[in-house]
C-alpha cells in the first residue's frame, strides 16, 4: 500500500495547563524507519517526540505503538504552556544505511493555539 501520512486537524486550540492530542495516521509502515514529531520546519525545527523508545517529558503516545501493525502515531501533550504554540508535523523516516535516517514524508501539519487559562 502506498505510504501516506495524515494529520486530520489543521489546527487545535488548547487552554494553558490542559492537554491536547495531535493526531497522525499512516497507511503503511514500509519502508521501515522511525516516526517522529517536530514543531516548526527547516533547520530550526524542534524534536517533540520520537517513537524509538526515548522518554519525552509531557509527551506520550496515544495508541500502543508496540503493536507490530500499529498505524496510529498520535501524541498527547500534557500541561500545555504558551511556549508550545506552533505548527507540529508528523514525519515518517526511512532507515538509512548510515546516520541520519532519510525523511520521506510529512503530514500536512497541525497548528496548536494556546489560549490563556481562564481565571
Amino acid at each position: 500500500k502506498e505510504l501516506k501520512v495524515t494529520q486530520p486537524e489543521k489546527s487545535v486550540s488548547v487552554a494553558a495547563g490542559d492537554s491536547t492530542v495531535l493526531n497522525c495516521t499512516l497507511t503503511s509502515l514500509l519502508p521501515v524507519g522511525p516516526i517522529k514529531w517536530y514543531r516548526g520546519v527547516g533547520q530550526s525545527r524542534l524534536l517533540i517526540y520520537s517513537f524509538t523508545g526515548e522518554h519525552f517529558p509531557r509527551v506520550t503516545n496515544v495508541s500502543d505503538a508496540t503493536k507490530r501493525n500499529n498505524m496510529d502515531f498520535s501524541i498527547r501533550i500534557s500541561n500545555v504552556t504558551p511556549e508550545d504554540a506552533g505548527t507540529y508535523y508528523c514525519v515518517k523516516f526511512q532507515k538509512g544505511p548510515s546516520e541520519p535516517d532519510t525523511e520521506i514524508q510529512s503530514g500536512g501539519g497541525t497548528e496548536v493555539y494556546v489560549l490563556a487559562k481562564p481565571s
Partner: antibody, heavy 118, light 107 residues
C-alpha cells in the same frame, strides 16, 4: 538494572502441557513488547512469539500457532508462554526477551530448560 | 532465511567482519546477538542495524545495506570468542528470524 527471569521449565511427556513464566524488573514492563525465543540442543535461536505492550496483539511463527499462547500480566510484571501438545522437537532452552521499538531484542533472560521425553 | 558464515577466525587485535544476508532492506531491521556458550543467555551487541547498547564496547559496530548486514569487531579480543547470531525483524510479515550463527575463534 533490567532483569528477566524465566521459570516453569522441566521434564514432561509428549502430548502434555507446560506454562512458562518470565518475571521482569528494572524497567517499566507495561511499556515494552516482549517475545519468547528458544534454542534446541546444539541448534540456533528460534523466535516463537511476541506480544504488544498492552497485551492485545500477539504474533507467532507458523510452527507453534494454535499450540502455544503468549500472554502477559502487566500488574504482575510477568510474561507467560502456555505450551500444549508438546513433542520431543520442543525440547529446548526457552528465553524471554525485551523488544526494542522496532521489534528486535535488547535484553534476554537466562532461560529455562524444557525437556519433552517419554 | 538469513545466511551467515559458519565460522570465522582472527588473531587478537585484528578486525573481524561477519556478514548476514537474506533480508529485504526496505522492510528489515537487523540485530546481532553474542552467545558465549550453548544454552547461556544471549547478549545483544547491536540492534536497529547499527545501534550499540551502552554497556557494549565500542569495538563492536554494525551496518546494513542492500540485502545484508555486517557486524564488525575492530581490534578483536580473546573474550570476544563466541557464537554470533544475526537476527532480523521483517516489517512486511511481522516475523523475527535468526541466522544459524557464526562461531568466532580468536587464535
Amino acid at each position: 538494572d533490567v532483569q528477566l527471569v524465566e521459570s516453569g521449565g522441566g521434564v514432561v511427556r509428549p502430548g502434555e502441557s507446560l506454562r512458562l513464566s518470565c518475571a521482569a524488573s528494572g524497567f517499566t514492563f507495561s511499556s515494552y513488547a516482549m517475545s519468547w525465543v528458544r534454542q534446541a540442543p546444539g541448534k540456533g535461536l528460534e523466535w516463537l512469539a511476541g506480544i504488544s505492550a498492552g497485551g492485545s496483539d500477539t504474533y507467532y511463527i507458523d510452527s507453534v500457532k494454535g499450540r502455544f499462547t503468549i500472554s502477559r500480566d502487566n500488574s504482575k510484571n510477568s510474561l507467560y508462554l502456555q505450551m500444549n501438545s508438546l513433542t520431543a522437537e520442543d525440547t529446548a532452552v526457552y528465553y524471554c526477551a525485551r523488544e526494542t521499538w522496532n521489534h528486535l531484542f535488547d535484553y534476554w533472560g537466562l532461560g529455562t530448560l524444557v525437556t519433552v521425553s517419554s | 532465511a538469513l545466511t551467515q558464515p559458519a565460522s570465522v577466525s582472527a588473531n587478537p587485535g585484528e578486525t573481524v567482519k561477519i556478514t548476514c544476508s537474506g533480508g529485504d532492506y526496505y522492510s528489515t531491521y537487523y540485530g546481532w546477538y553474542q552467545q558465549k556458550s550453548p544454552g547461556s543467555a544471549p547478549v545483544t551487541v547491536i540492534h536497529s542495524d547499527d545501534k550499540r547498547p551502552s554497556d557494549i564496547p565500542s569495538r563492536f559496530s554494525g551496518s546494513a545495506s542492500g540485502s545484508a548486514a555486517t557486524l564488525t569487531i575492530t581490534g578483536v579480543r580473546v573474550e570476544d570468542e563466541a557464537v554470533y547470531f544475526c537476527g532480523a525483524y521483517d516489517g512486511r510479515t511481522y516475523i523475527n528470524t535468526f541466522g544459524a550463527g557464526t562461531t568466532l575463534t580468536v587464535l
